[in-house]
Interface confidence: low
Amino acid sequence: SDKLYQRKEPVISSVHTKVKGIAEVTENVTEGGVTKLGHSIFDTADYTFPLQGNSFFVMTNYVKSEGQVQTLCPEYPRRGAQCSSDRRCKKGWMDPQSKGIQTGRCVPYDKTRKTCEVSAWCPTEEEKEAPRPALLRSAENFTVLIKNNIHFPGHNYTTRNILPTMNGSCTFHKTWDPQCSIFRLGDIFQEAGENFTEVAVQGGIMGIEIYWDCNLDSWSHHCRPRYSFRRLDDKNMDESFVPGYNFRYAKYYKENNVEKRTLIKAFGIRFDILVFGTGGKF
Amino acid sequence: SDKLYQRKEPVISSVHTKVKGIAEVTENVTEGGVTKLGHSIFDTADYTFPLQGNSFFVMTNYVKSEGQVQTLCPEYPRRGAQCSSDRRCKKGWMDPQSKGIQTGRCVPYDKTRKTCEVSAWCPTEEEKEAPRPALLRSAENFTVLIKNNIHFPGHNYTTRNILPTMNGSCTFHKTWDPQCSIFRLGDIFQEAGENFTEVAVQGGIMGIEIYWDCNLDSWSHHCRPRYSFRRLDDKNMDESFVPGYNFRYAKYYKENNVEKRTLIKAFGIRFDILVFGTGGKF
Amino acid sequence: SDKLYQRKEPVISSVHTKVKGIAEVTENVTEGGVTKLGHSIFDTADYTFPLQGNSFFVMTNYVKSEGQVQTLCPEYPRRGAQCSSDRRCKKGWMDPQSKGIQTGRCVPYDKTRKTCEVSAWCPTEEEKEAPRPALLRSAENFTVLIKNNIHFPGHNYTTRNILPTMNGSCTFHKTWDPQCSIFRLGDIFQEAGENFTEVAVQGGIMGIEIYWDCNLDSWSHHCRPRYSFRRLDDKNMDESFVPGYNFRYAKYYKENNVEKRTLIKAFGIRFDILVFGTGGKF
């Protein structure tokens, strides 16, 4: 509450996160023309990335384009991209939706369709839907430990969200354990009124707000965090504005002295930890 | 404008960026002693990195040191690094400019020059100028979509820069479309009074400021962002303070059971999105 | 000092860091059953990562698990994980401490111990102590250049911590050179009353606070940074809350058409640069 006689100062904050959990992923794998069911295990090194600061990312879904090599090939026949003659293809043209630079030739993509030839990483990425249900949907049961150190330099006061009396076997719960800083990802979504299973398909951004309303006067000292959760990406966003949360990254390798790459389009949840609040003192 | 009767609150912000564009790169490639012109295509997975939060990086230039292996070799003969006898070389010495630890021996670098031998990734990186013009100078035509979700927790008010009425085929323009949140990189530089082609060589840091001056009173409600741009690195910086923006990263691999790496010195533009402002309410 | 007649405004800040230094690492390397002493050189591309914004990370220690492949194997026999019969192993169970999913079978780990079989990256990571002393303990002598650009948009005032009069051969010292922005990592720790050699083993988080208290009135203009240092992680933290600072990442490769990875558990210092302060003007 506002105490007008107090000198207020904004919080200076540092955050450290640690995600735990293992996911078992089952997907169709095609090798030598034969499709079979593949099982694999994803641990933290596979689904998250060494990140700094107030964000962490958990991959919940992906689409792979394996064995790409730099050469010429037909572009993917997405809506409006097909051609019947070279006239439709413009040498040097880069369509923002495309993945390469047109050579000016119209070539067969498959038995029935022709598209403009491009200089690109080939074969070009197929613009297929993200798998549904999400491949790492079990990430709902992962947990994240959040450590938050705060400082009010003007009041020369420092504290943190984890106290010596706490132990690492708790799980945050709004009612039962509101000071525990170990959060189950599914619970974060539930608290925010969102469906993890649904968001995991296309990805999204989730805010974890940590609010410090600190009274630093000795006679009524109080300085503990309050956690709340809200979705930050717009679930009703127009297609043209790229709904969800995904990014592409590549693993490069050499095969028979040819530079190749596997392109991964990673969908997932980016968690932003937003720390705010004030310290007041007479 | 300042309304003194209002309770002001700083903005809590979350940012998500998405870069689009393809670059065609032409460079001299040496293989088996033969130098030929190589063409390659760079897409988002090649020139940007999965980044969190309020920054994104676009690589505009690079220098590669391929096939490095951990062994002993002469260091690069930069100014003042040449030697004529072992006396000039100090066993165990690490010159901050050097890339290895001296063995104490003075050895031939080439037919005319000798330098101190070092234990390092060899052959050591040549300290050559960044290519001019920049290899990915066409990044000027890339676009970035910026999504910004803001929150005034004290006023329990949330909004975002992208409204349902907007569409994804716009491009930001200060006069014609100041609310569009898709920015052409070259336009950002032009607005900031900077030359993209020039900065792309050595790299730099560009600030995209998003200012929210929100009046949350129902009778005169206003809460839309204002975008402005300014260069954040010092273009007049002394050489000793490392002008521009670059970093080194490595791709590791094994060849005949020997651990090798390709070292990439990546130059580019780091874009920092700086969100600030206040929400005022009676 | 507080000038009540002034209009105060919080600082808008952008940070760029550049780490320099080389470490020589000596460790036991086992190949073909033979253990020998291995020497290697780590430069910036090996011990730091391309990071954005207000944080940088320096790896000071590591544990490697080489040649992991996705298959079935016994889990690591940490305290309480051993079994004597299949009854102890629960098919489908994921112990948060374990690195895989139990198959339900109890199998030999070595000649004397049996553990539950798991589907995982195998052989599973050994839960061994971080090497002591730290492998990259010489990182104490690395230096970091910090460039900080600040802006008070309301006062239309911009400045930076590096002035044209400075030169790049200085090193920060609280008394002798308090405006130099090149910091020796060991000095940062000393200033914060911490022991680098000790923290380097398990890792930690160090705060570099940059305080701008700016008087922008022309008749008594002053706007220079003040640097201070404090440890941000809790050195007295309970084991269950994961003391220190580490993360796991993987290098993936193919061998005889089998996907493999080397898992690296990297310990190190994350440096958070916390910029705060105000600009006041009549």
Epitope: T165, C170, D177, D187 | - | G80
Partner: nanobody
Framework: EVQLVESGGGLVQAGGSLRLSCVAS????????MGWFRQAPGKEREFVAA???????HYADSVKGRFTLSRDNARNTVSLHMNSLKPEDTAVYYC?????????????????WGQGTQVTVSS
């Protein structure tokens, strides 16, 4: 492996009291949370109460103020004191334990279960 054995069930009149006990044996140091669930005839198993490793106690709304949970770490025992019993409290009561960090009321997060003990409240 962890074994759980419940005791203390029985027949009691409405308004009366009972005390259920659960003893854990085996790999008990790994137990971080212990709880009670119940299953009435023809119904799903539901959460009753749980206690975490640091003694944070969680109750279902339907038993708050009537049931009290306590834990004796030295004896690896958790006890449920049930007062002001109602006919709708009639069920088989199961003791459960787990070694993970998930929310206390989620049945699927418990790895170890007892055989159950019958509680019947007559009107």
């Amino acid at each position: 492996e962890v074994q759980l054995v419940e005791s203390g069930g029985g027949l009691v009149q409405a308004g009366g009291s009972l005390r259920l006990s659960c003893v854990a044996s085996g790999r008990t140091f790994s137990i971080l949370t212990m709880g009670w669930f119940r299953q009435a005839p023809g119904k799903e198993r539901e959460f009753v109460a749980a206690i975490s490793g640091i003694g944070a106690i969680h109750y279902a709304d339907s038993v708050k103020g009537r049931f009290t949970l306590s834990r004796d770490n030295a004896r690896n025992t958790v006890s449920l004191h049930m007062n002001s019993l109602k006919p709708e409290d009639t069920a088989v009561y199961y003791c459960a334990a787990k070694a993970n960090y998930e929310s206390p009321s989620r049945e699927t997060s418990y790895a170890y279960w007892g055989q159950g003990t019958q509680v019947t409240v007559s009107s």
